[in-house]
Amino acid sequence: MAVTACQGLGFVVSLIGIAGIIAATCMDQWSTQDLYNNPVTAVFNYQGLWRSCVRESSGFTECRGYFTLLGLPAMLQAVRALMIVGIVLGAIGLLVSIFALKCIRIGSMEDSAKANMTLTSGIMFIVSGLCAIAGVSVFANMLVTNFWMSTANMYTGMGGMVQTVQTRYTFGAALFVGWVAGGLTLIGGVMMCIACRGLAPEETNYKAVSYHASGHSVAYKPGGFKASTGFGSNTKNKKIYDGGARTEDEVQSYPSKHDYV
């Protein structure tokens, strides 16, 4: 039961995380104009990965896409790439994890296959989350560097007649969305990996042990699945795993060197 819950929760958390990564990637507020002492501005600038926008106090908002690839900073291209890789990996991970969910039965898929798929999706979510966190962090670092550079140059021309006020940019909402979403995807991935360990059949060094109960018998052998079918019609609800790991509907517990590796 705990394994199913962990897997399900991992899936949901990752789903929310990936939705957040997609939202952050599409958002225009990666960097917003620093208002420093002036909370009310006549012209407010903000920028995303794909376009930059200007909102006037009149309410008029104009956005312009970056219609060049070669003219864009390499760092921005890198951030775009990291976010897209994160989304793609996350999307594939979601697709894989749907089929890996213990509560969803697809044909005669064995639990070992589901365990492998859970692990695969978990790793994908972890990498996806890391990509998003890395992308957002690279952009944030770029902002911090530019912020202090523009602060240093802010009052250029103060000695002369004309002053040039440079627009400084600070962290936009998308950065925080990206960090949280990346973190959630990462956590979801870890949960999937933990769930995988509970799903996976465990190898043990025990010799075959036979249990006899009221004329029915089941022989357990290391390295194999059910050896005999003494339980008749009941066996369809029961899979007997090596190493003593048990399914939800098993009543008896069998000796095991360890429950989880």
Partner: antibody, heavy 118, light 113 residues
């Protein structure tokens, strides 16, 4: 047709207060910032402050802070500008104006003449 | 605050001739985000409120005759009336629309020679 109709001329004594109204019609009142600009005789136009009819948020010119108060009556689509502690140099024509694209004023009231004299 | 300075203070031009009014700001009015200059031009006739002519330094307001044109960038701007008409006699103001508080030039009085 967009119209901004202001209240009539006022004569006040120094130290008194004046409240000028600006009734808007012909557009959605809550969608545009309302600004107040004054023009003293032979002087340049001087921006006083602004109010958003939807949120009620205001922004004032530091020069007038503490003396000017902008208010609204949404139901009547009317904006008000109150200037207190009047001085002789406050003698001017006071305009309300609607802000549009480009942060420009596309429609203005006809102006309200306020004379401060002892 | 941004200081707006217009030149000349008054100008006399013959009918049909070109009139040019200059405006200089103490800070750049060019917004890097959209490469637009936040400068506005108004026309004011005696006893009337100002009338919007041009915004974004060069965009003509609807209904304004095409003999009015605006140009310039950064801190230096120009309003040009290509062929002066009798009804163009007025005071012209430039306005900083970039930062609060909005500020206006002292005005240029245009007359017929």
């Amino acid at each position: 047709e967009v119209q901004l109709v202001q209240s009539g001329a006022e004569v006040k004594k120094p130290g008194a207060s004046v409240k000028v109204s600006c009734k808007a019609s012909g557009y959605t009142f809550t969608s545009y910032w309302m600004h107040w600009v004054r023009q003293a005789p032979g002087q340049r136009l001087e921006w006083m402050g602004m109010i958003h009819p939807n949120s009620g948020s205001t922004n004032y010119n530091e020069k007038f802070k503490g003396r000017v108060t902008l208010t609204l009556d949404k139901s009547a689509s009317t904006a008000y500008m109150e200037l207190s502690s009047l001085r002789s140099e406050d003698t001017a024509v006071y305009y309300c104006a609607r802000l549009k694209t480009g942060n420009s004023f596309d429609y203005w009231g006809q102006g309200t003449t306020v004379t401060v004299s002892s | 605050d941004i200081v707006m300075t217009q030149s000349p203070d008054s100008l006399a031009v013959s009918l049909g001739e070109r009139a040019t009014i200059n405006c200089k700001s103490s800070q750049s009015l060019l917004n890097s985000g959209n490469q637009k200059n936040y400068l506005t031009w108004y026309q004011q006739k005696p006893g009337q409120p100002p009338k919007l002519l041009i915004y974004w330094a060069s965009t003509r307001e609807s209904g304004v005759p095409d003999r009015f044109s605006g140009s310039g960038s950064g801190t230096d701007f120009t309003l040009t009336i290509s062929s002066l008409q009798a009804e163009d006699v007025a005071v012209y103001y430039c306005q900083n629309a970039y930062t609060y508080p909005f500020t206006f030039g002292q005005g240029t009085k245009l007359e017929i020679k």
